[in-house]
Interface confidence: medium
Amino acid sequence: DPVLCFTQYEESSGKCKGLLGGGVSVEDCCLNTAFAYQKRSGGLCQPCRSPRWSLWSTWAPCSVTCSEGSQLRYRRCVGWNGQCSGKVAPGTLEWQLQACEDQQCCPEMGGWSGWGPWEPCSVTCSKGTRTRRRACNHPAPKCGGHCPGQAQESEACDTQQVCPTHGAWATWGPWTPCSASCHGGPHEPKETRSRKCSAPEPSQKPPGKPCPGLAYEQRRCTGLPPCPVAGGWGPWGPVSPCPVTCGLGQTMEQRTCNHPVPQHGGPFCAGDATRTHICNTAVPCPVDGEWDSWGEWSPCIRRNMKSISCQEIPGQQSRGRTCRGRKFDGHRCAGQQQDIRHCYSIQHCPLKGSWSEWSTWGLCMPPCGPNPTRARQRLCTPLLPKYPPTVSMVEGQGEKNVTFWGRPLPRCEELQGQKLVVEEKRPCLHVPACKDPEEEEL
C-alpha cells in the first residue's frame, strides 16, 4: 500500500517531520533509513531504521486523587523491517503499572458559623448592595476540604437619594468617504466624522456635567494611491536536478510574477511560484554499522592453572560484541570488538552472607491483565573477600583494577524459613485499563 514519506523522524516526540510526498511504497521510502513514513495522515509515524523500543511515556495521572491508586505508562516498538527485543513487532505497545498516592487523606467537608451583621450600603445615592459574611469553622474542613455554599451573601439597599448623571461621548461615527479613490482629481478630498453626547446625556435635576471637547472633526485625505495594476505569471522554468545521490529527493520548478509586474498596489499573482516533484534515484542510502550490546564475560581463568576459584589469585576474562547492520558502504563501527579485564573468580564459592534491607516495591504485574500485584524482596548477599582491589600483572605496566566474577554460594541464617530470598507481595489498587493513546485520539 502507498504511504506518506518523510525525511526525518523526531525521537523525542515520535513525530514525522519534513513531508517528502505520498503515493510511494514503504520499501522505496525506506531506501534511506533516516526517513520515516505514515500509513495515513495523522496516523502513527514509523522510522525506517531497524526497530527498537521508544522511551517510556510519562506516568499517567494516578487513578484516584486521594488514598492509594495505580498508574500506567507505555512504550512503543518503532522501526521497520524487523522486531524489537522480545520478538515484538513494530507498532506494539508495552505497558508498566505501579502503585501511586497523590494525597494520603481524602478531603472532609466543614460547617458554617452563623451569619455576621450586615455591612453599610455600597453607595451614597440611588440603589446599591450590602453584604454579610460567615466563617467556615463549625467544624473546620480537613485535608483540603471546604464548606458547601457561599461565605458571603448580598442584598439590595436603597439610599433614597437621586444620583446626578454626567455626560459622556458616544463613539465617533465613521469617516465620510473621500471624493476619489485614486490621486489626481480636481478637488482636494476631505473626510469628516462626528459624535453625540449621548452615552449618557447629562441629567438636569440634579445637574450633571456636559461632555468635554468638540462634537466633530475634519481632515484631509492623504496618500491616495495611483490606480492599481494586477500581476500575471510568466512561464514555468526548467526542472532542477535531483538533489540527492540515494533514496528519494525533491525537484522544483519556478515561475515569476512579471507578466506583467503588479503596480501601484495591484494584487500579486494568485497561486504558487514553485511546484515540486519526487525524484527516485533507486539507489539505497549507506547504513552505518552499530555495535550490538556486549556479550557475557568469559570465565575468569589464569593460563596454565586448572582453577583459580575461591583463591586470592587474579586471572583474566574477556567479552566481545558484533558490528551489525552495515550496508551499502556505510561506516564501520568505531571502537574495540573485544574487552579484557582482570578478575578474581568466586564461582560456586561458599561465602558468608547477610540479609539485605527490603528492596523498593517492584512494578505491578501483569500491567494489562487481571489482579496485578507488586513485590519486594530481601536477598542473602555474599560478603566478598578482602582481596587487593588492584594488582600489578606485568612489570612496568602499573596497577590494574581487579573485579570479582562468578556466582558465589552465600550462606545466611534462615529468615522466615528461607535461606536465599524472602518475598512479600501486595495487590495493586484502582487499576486503569491499557488503551492505545493513538486510538483514543480517533
Epitope: 515484538v88 501483569p366 500491567p367 485499563a433
Partner: nanobody, 129 residues
Framework: QVQLVESGGGLVQAGDSLRLSCAAS????????MGWFRQAPGKEREFVAA????????YYADSVKGRFTISRDNAKNRVYLQMNSLKPEDTAVYSC??????????????????????WGQGTQVTVSS
C-alpha cells in the same frame, strides 16, 4: 488439559449472518486476550479480530471492520464472533486462540499468530453466492 472448542459454523447465503462461539477450559480464561483467525484453502492463516482480557479494547482486520463483532463472557469462559453481511470471500476455517502475556497491546501485536499460546481445531464457514 487446555482445550479451545469452536462451534456455530455452517453453509449460508451471501448477506446472511452467523455467530461463532469458542468454549475455553484448562486455563484461567479471564486472564487471557482472545483472537479469531481464518484460513481459506490454499491461503495463509489471516487475522480476523481480537479482544483484551477485560473486553475494554477490540481490534479488527480492515476486511471485516463494520461487519464482524468480537465479544466475550468471562463468567461462561466463552468468546464469540458475530458475522453479519457475509460474503463468498469470508469462506474459511475459523479458529480461536488465547494469549496470556498481559504486557502488550495494539493491533500490531494481536494480528500476529505467533503471539498466541493456545489454539482450537477450527469450524468451517461456507458462504455461497
Amino acid at each position: 488439559q487446555v482445550q479451545l472448542v469452536e462451534s456455530g459454523g455452517g453453509l449460508v447465503q451471501a448477506g446472511d449472518s452467523l455467530r461463532l462461539s469458542c468454549a475455553a477450559s484448562g486455563f484461567t480464561f479471564s486472564s487471557y486476550a482472545m483472537g479469531w483467525f481464518r484460513q481459506a484453502p490454499g491461503k495463509e492463516r489471516e487475522f480476523v479480530a481480537a479482544i483484551t482480557w477485560s473486553g475494554v479494547s477490540t481490534y479488527y482486520a480492515d476486511s471485516v471492520k463494520g461487519r464482524f463483532t468480537i465479544s466475550r463472557d468471562n463468567a461462561k469462559n466463552r468468546v464469540y464472533l458475530q458475522m453479519n453481511s457475509l460474503k463468498p470471500e469470508d469462506t474459511a476455517v475459523y479458529s480461536c486462540a488465547a494469549d496470556g502475556s498481559g504486557r502488550y497491546s495494539g493491533m500490531e501485536y494481536y494480528n500476529r499468530d505467533w503471539v498466541y499460546d493456545y489454539w482450537g481445531q477450527g469450524t468451517q464457514v461456507t458462504v455461497s453466492s
